[in-house]
Every structure is written in C-alpha cells, then in structure tokens.
C-alpha cells in the first residue's frame, strides 16, 4: 500500500529555515524574500512506530530526492545524517527504526524525537548557518521546537 505522505517545510522556533549545506547536510538560517525558495521541502511519511496518543511516527524524506533523515551512532554518539536510499523501495510503511521520528505536538510547536534514540531530538543552534543535528537536551540553548508549513504537491 502506498504510504500516506505530505509535503512541508520546517522552521525552528526562531523562524530559521532549513537549507541544504553540501550533499548530505542541512543547516538552519534566516531567509527572506526570494531566498525562501532555497529551503528544503520535506516529504513527511506516516509510518509504523511506537505510536501513542501524543506521538505520531513519521519519516522525513527530502522531496523528489532519495535522501532521508536518519539517526545513527557515530563515535558512540547519536547523530543525525542524510542517508541515501533506493527510491524503488522508499518510502514504505515499515521503515527501519533509524529513519523514524516521533512527531510530538506541544502548544502548536512540533518536536521530532528519534525513535532509535529516545529523548534525542532534531535540533538547531541559536547561531546562524549552523548544521541541523541530533541533540540530547530539551529546553536548553539548542532549539528543538519547529513549526510546519504545508506545501502543495
């Protein structure tokens, strides 16, 4: 069965947009006007995961690219990466755990918790033009809250 997906962009709670920084990295920075076209469009797929009444499991692919955000251990630390997949097989309902994020909505803001590494979240830095990363703290310096903007297919 085709997995249900929607196209969207994400901005952190400081209104920084997410853009590509090289082939396998995202960075967050403030964009205005025509520069907004640089922001990445995600294909958010609704997948199987440890769903709860507060958490919806999703996979975050880059629209029309065979790249998905995934969480892996690098040097013993949970790390966010962009991983290339076979477009014939993705997206799928039963995504591998490293691709799955728990989408959590709190006060109209979204958090994306790694299913592979509970309590680690997609995060951005306060500083401009820094990589999007997987962070293990909430409510500190780093930003874990996002808003989602729907994009027509």
């Amino acid at each position: 069965a085709p997995v249900r997906s929607l196209n969207c962009t994400l901005r952190d709670s400081q209104q920084k947009s997410l853009v590509m920084s090289g082939p396998y990295e995202l960075k967050a920075l403030h964009l205005q006007g025509q520069d907004m076209e640089q922001q990445v469009v995600f294909s958010m797929s609704f997948v199987q995961g440890e769903e709860s009444n507060d958490k919806i499991p999703v996979a975050l692919g880059l629209k029309e690219k065979n790249l998905y955000l995934s969480c892996v251990l690098k040097d013993d630390k949970p790390t966010l990466q962009l991983e290339s997949v076979d477009p014939k097989n993705y997206p799928k309902k039963k995504m591998e755990k490293r691709f799955v994020f728990n989408k959590i909505e709190i006060n109209n803001k979204l958090e994306f918790e790694s299913a592979q590494f509970p309590n680690w979240y997609i995060s951005t830095s306060q500083a401009e033009n820094m990589p999007v990363f997987l962070g293990g703290t909430k409510g500190g310096q780093d930003i874990t809250d996002f808003t989602m903007q729907f994009v027509s297919s």
């Epitope: 069965a1 440890e50 709860s52 009444n53 507060d54 309902k93 039963k94 995504m95 591998e96 509970p118």
Partner: antibody
Framework: EVQLQESGPGLVKPSETLSLTCTVS????????VSWIRQPPGKGLEWIGL???????YYNSPLKSRLTISKDTSKSQVSLKLSSVTAADTAVYYC????????????????WGQGTLVTVSS | DIQMTQSPSSLSASVGDRVTITCQTS??????MNWYQQKPGKAPKLLIS???TLRPGVPSRFSGSGSGTDFTFTISSLQPEDFATYYC?????????FGQGTKLEIK
C-alpha cells in the same frame, strides 16, 4: 517461557474505577509493549490500548477519556484503570504481549493472558 | 480506524471438511493480518501472522493468504479440536481492530 496473568476484583460497582494488573514473565517490559483487550460475554474482541516499552501509551478513542494504562517495570506489572464504569464495561479483560518486531511485525500480539472476568453491578 | 468485515459469522461443518473464512479491510493493510483461534473460556491463540506465516507448533492444516484488503483463512481438513471461534486482526495501524468472529460448529 512467556506468560501473562491478569488479576483484580471480579466485581465493580457502577461509577467506580475498574483496576486490573497484568503480571508478566519471560520477557522484559522495557523491551516489549503490552496491550489490553476485552470481550463482553458472548461477544467479540475489542482492543482497548497499549503501553510501549518506553512507557508511551495509545488509548483507543471510545475509552480514551476514562482509561489509564501504566506499568512498574521492576515488578513486571502493567496496570489498567477504567473510571466511571457502567454495565457495558462488563467483560473478560485480557493483556497480551506485542511482537515489537520493527520493520516486520510491530503491532501484532503473540502471547495472551488467560483473562479475568469483571462484572459491573451494584 | 480500519473497519473489518469477517464472514461468515457462523459455520457448520463436519470433521474432514475444508473450511474457509474471509476478512476484508476498509483500507489496504499489505500483509498485516493475523488469525486467532478461541475456545470457550480460553484466551485467543495466535495461529497465523503476516497473512500467511504459520506460528510455531500450529498444525499445517491451517493456512492463510491474501494481501491488501482481502484475506482468507483455511482449514484444509477439520479435526474435532478445531471447533472454536476464529478472529481476524489487522496489525497495520493503530488502533488495532478485530473482525466480528466466525463460530465454527459441528454439523
């Protein structure tokens, strides 16, 4: 060997809270989810909700406002509380282990307890 | 929620008969279909998962097939111990939903 055993009072008064415990052995509640299912006398099966290994819960909509599922991992116990019960909540209540096979069979249930009959009556 | 339509609701058959039960889902669930056997006063027992995978220790006369929205459960040659109620369960999406059950009785 995987085993689940439900326990709790067999009789609950209307408007009170139904409380049941599921004691498990042969697997860890940190690694596997546990579902609750009920079956009114002579009727079919209704899935109530579950608690995952990490402690998150999913409650089926019809019962959501009255339902609490929690666990004590150290005691290998999962509990169900259903408030404001009526005669319609009279049923055999089962707990069951989730298969938890990521990317294969995450939501299926393989082992069940023997069930416990709860009657709601004054 | 995914709706389940299981049929027939009851069935009379004899030892040695071939019996088929069907389950239809309101949404495509790939192969996330399970079949359970329940005897009076007992808990349901998982016979088949993922539409066609026989659980260890379950006799080979039980089989399952189908994918998408249409599923079939078959007992190739009924034995006296097979008279029970059978339920389908979709495990594709939460909330999990059961079929209404099929009571298999001796003719």
């Amino acid at each position: 060997e995987v085993q689940l055993q439900e326990s709790g009072p067999g009789l609950v008064k209307p408007s009170e809270t139904l409380s049941l415990t599921c004691t498990v052995s042969g697997f860890s509640l940190m690694d596997y989810g546990v579902s609750w299912i009920r079956q009114p006398p002579g009727k079919g099966l209704e899935w109530i909700g579950l608690i995952w290994g990490g402690g998150d819960t999913y409650y089926n909509s019809p019962l959501k406002s009255r339902l609490t599922i929690s666990k004590d991992t150290s005691k290998s116990q999962v509990s169900l509380k259903l408030s404001s019960v009526t005669a319609a909540d009279t049923a055999v209540y089962y707990c069951a282990k989730q298969r938890n096979l990521w990317g294969y069979d995450l939501y299926g249930m393989d082992y069940w307890g023997q069930g416990t009959l709860v009657t709601v009556s004054s | 929620d995914i709706q389940m339509t299981q049929s027939p609701s009851s069935l009379s058959a004899s030892v040695g008969d071939r019996v088929t039960i069907t389950c239809q889902t309101s949404t495509d669930i790939d192969d996330d279909m399970n079949w359970y056997q329940q005897k009076p006063g007992k808990a349901p027992k998982l016979l088949i998962s993922l539409a066609s995978t026989l659980r260890p220790g379950v006799p080979s006369r039980f089989s399952g097939s189908g994918s998408g929205t249409d599923f079939t459960f078959t007992i190739s040659s009924l034995q006296p111990e097979d008279f029970a109620t059978y339920y389908c369960l979709q495990s594709s999406w939460l909330p999990l939903t059961f079929g209404q059950g099929t009571k298999l009785e001796i003719k």
